[in-house]
């Protein structure tokens, strides 16, 4: 279930999560919702300050890298 | 167990930039995260800002265009700096450390060091 | 103006029990952020008291308790003693702000 994660637990999460993608500790600029928006929160606010889940943690994750084309 | 030294000068001129240091014995840099709290005379607490040592740093609003929190992870010391202080900033400061234990609360704290704003 | 508001004062004879609110919004304590309480003896660095809104860390008296419910938080002392005699302050984390706030601090006395 939801857990916080803080510190080098949290670190050890996202590669779990996200192996070779890599991931992010803010969301990417203009990721989701719109940039006037109040200050961004990064993954450590979300998941070492209130309890967070998987899919909280993968959408700090990079996205996949296109396929090269022979 | 982790400890928490601040040091820095107890004196600081007006507009002129304020720099702390917090030196980190009994446990890595590189695992917690890391925190600076000031407490103005007579006054409540007041956060300033954290960092993880991966880089990733987040500022009280009031104070973030003048903050600035880095690492010296060979000296396994953090440190502060707060530029163009007035009296206003005059307070204690302290360090403290998020171990990860405590589910974000702040759980080791350096014995604070008093900083006056004065000409 | 704190974005937690705390009473500034609370006081108790030795032997009651006294409690201390925290008042937030839904952006902080309301949206899910833990609270966690400090307490702070004259001239000294304050100490955590209680983190995730309920759980003392190791050495703290099972006197001490947190409980959180919507946008507030409390912090009960029972079996008050002169040791306590202390400033409290709650601490969560606030979305709209994207940090870490305090409330203003409760300055407990005991008396007698």
């Known amino acids: 279930g939801p857990e916080t994660l803080c510190g080098a637990e949290l670190v050890d999460a996202l590669q779990f999560v996200c192996g070779d993608r890599g991931f992010y500790f803010n969301k990417p600029t203009g990721y989701g919702s719109s940039s006037r928006r109040a200050p961004q929160t990064g993954i450590v606010d979300e998941c070492c300050f209130r309890s967070c889940d998987l899919r909280r943690l993968e959408m700090y994750c990079a996205p996949l890298k296109p396929a090269k084309s022979a | 167990q982790v400890q928490l030294q601040e040091s820095g000068p107890g004196l600081v001129k007006p507009s002129e930039t304020l720099s702390l240091t917090c030196t980190v014995s009994?446990?890595?840099?590189?695992?917690?995260?890391w925190s600076w709290i000031r407490q103005p005379p007579g006054k409540g607490l007041e956060w300033i800002g954290y960092?993880?040592?991966?880089?990733?740093?987040n500022y009280n609003p009031s104070l973030k265009s003048r903050v600035t929190i880095s690492v010296d992870t060979s000296k396994n010391q953090f440190s502060l700096k707060l530029s163009s202080v007035t009296a206003a900033d005059t307070a204690v400061y302290y360090c403290a450390c998020i171990t990860g234990t405590t589910k974000g609360g702040m759980d080791v704290w350096g014995q604070g060091t008093t900083v006056t704003v004065s000409s | 103006q704190s974005v937690l508001t705390q009473p500034p004062s609370v006081s108790g004879a030795p032997g009651q029990r006294v409690t201390i609110s925290c008042t937030g919004s839904?952006?902080?304590?309301?949206?899910?952020?833990?609270v966690h309480w400090y307490q702070q003896l004259p001239g000294t660095a304050p100490k955590l008291l209680i983190y995730?809104?309920?759980n003392r860390p190791s050495g703290v008296p099972d006197r001490f308790s947190g409980s959180k419910s919507g946008t507030s938080a409390s912090l009960a002392i029972t079996g008050l003693q002169a040791d306590d005699e202390a400033d409290y302050y709650c601490?969560?984390?606030?979305?709209?702000?994207?940090?870490?706030?305090f409330g203003g601090g409760t300055k407990l006395t005991v008396l007698g």
């Open positions: 960092f993880f040592y991966s880089g990733y740093t």
């Open positions: 839904s952006s902080n304590i309301g949206a899910g952020y833990d």
């Open positions: 601490q969560s984390f606030d979305s709209s702000l994207s940090g870490s706030v």
């Open positions: 009994g446990g890595s840099i590189s695992s917690y995260y």
């Open positions: 995730g809104n309920n």
